[in-house]
Interface confidence: low
């Protein structure tokens, strides 16, 4: 779409695939930027998709920390990187991947 | 295990709208590593995703670009369900409708089917 | 529109080997995991290989997932093909906009 992306300015989380489906990360993750982002006005609006862990990820973990990434400014933008699953819901592009 | 119950008329009229529900059991709708689709197949389309229902601190909702204008889809947390809703279906709307569930580290697991046909 | 290409149809002997094609017609196949689902006649689908190449439980190791991004495209294999895997197969990815798209589908005959 042009214009600035978050994924070129953060670096990459190698080795990691996110979660099949957009989540925002658990209440016990240490900082959720998405709670201090206001929603941009967008007809398609997306939830923040943190990273988890390869391989076997655990759905009850979705991030492997509680960690900073770009997926956590991601909060009612549309699209969003990184490859997920089978889900039918949210984001399920690889990280660093652009989409068409 | 998830299982999902559909239900809904097997018979609608050209111009009036498709109704359908999907019951969840095994799973909740308002859960936050679920997404919640409806899909049809017929001879003419293959399968065709139609959208899906999902939560994250709130709801969303997508839908395909070939239905966009007149479908809905409502989740139903009170009953755990939720629901498909087709306005204006012609002839060409007749299909075999699925509810199914996606979820984490699965590919979708699928309702069983409701034919519907759309004649007068 | 991002389109998934398979197969019509493919028809081999039991015991023999079958490989089905999806090709996506842009984009990497690689930066969406692709699901496969087995159809039988009267039923609903049922996935076979989920996330590109896993296998969920109860699927048979006969059946394998891969990818090849020199031609775009993912692959089902079915090993020491059997009467019961006579079914329709469809792939399953996503579009740019995170939608799900499904392939054409792909007939498995296994010839008697």
């Known amino acids: 779409d042009g214009g600035f992306d978050l994924s070129d300015a953060l670096p990459d989380n190698e080795n990691k695939k996110p979660t099949a489906i957009p989540k925002k990360p658990s209440a016990g993750d240490d900082f959720d930027l998405g709670d201090a982002v206001v929603d941009g006005e967008n007809d398609d609006p997306r939830p923040p998709n943190p990273p988890k862990p390869m391989p076997n990820p655990n759905p009850n973990h979705p991030s492997s920390s509680g960690s900073f990434s770009d997926a956590d400014l991601a909060d009612g933008v549309s699209g969003g990187e990184g490859k997920g699953g089978s889900d039918g819901g949210g984001s399920h592009r690889k990280e660093g991947e652009e989409a068409d | 295990q998830v299982q999902l119950q559909q239900s809904g008329p097997g018979l609608v009229k050209p111009s009036q709208t498709l109704s359908l529900t999907c019951a969840i059991s095994?799973?909740?709708?308002?859960?936050?590593?679920?997404?919640w689709n409806w899909i049809r197949q017929s001879p003419s389309r293959g399968l065709e995703w139609l959208g899906r229902t999902y939560y994250r601190s709130k709801w969303y909702n997508d839908y395909a670009v070939s239905v966009k204008s007149r479908i809905t889809i409502n989740p139903d947390t009170s009953k755990n369900q939720f629901s498909l809703q087709l306005n204006s279906v012609t002839p060409e709307d007749t299909a075999v409708y699925y509810c199914a569930r996606g979820s984490y580290g699965s590919g979708l697991v699928w309702g069983q089917g409701t034919t519907v046909t759309v004649s007068s | 529109n991002f389109m998934l290409t398979q197969p019509h149809s493919v028809s081999e002997s039991p015991g023999k080997t079958v490989t089905i094609s999806c090709t996506g017609s842009s984009g990497s196949i690689a930066s969406n995991y692709v699901q496969w689902y087995q159809q039988r006649p009267g039923s609903a689908p049922t996935t076979v290989i989920y996330?590109?190449?896993?296998?969920p439980s109860g699927v048979p190791d006969r059946f394998s997932g891969s990818l090849d991004t020199s031609s775009n495209s993912a692959s089902l294999t079915i090993s020491g093909l059997r009467p019961e895997d006579e079914a329709d197969y469809y792939c399953?990815?996503?579009?740019?906009?995170?939608?799900?798209?499904f392939g054409g589908g792909t007939k498995v005959t296994v010839l008697s």
């Open positions: 996330e590109d190449d896993q296998r």
């Open positions: 399953q990815s996503y579009d740019n906009k995170d939608n799900v798209v």
């Open positions: 095994g799973d909740s709708v308002s859960s936050n590593s679920a997404a």
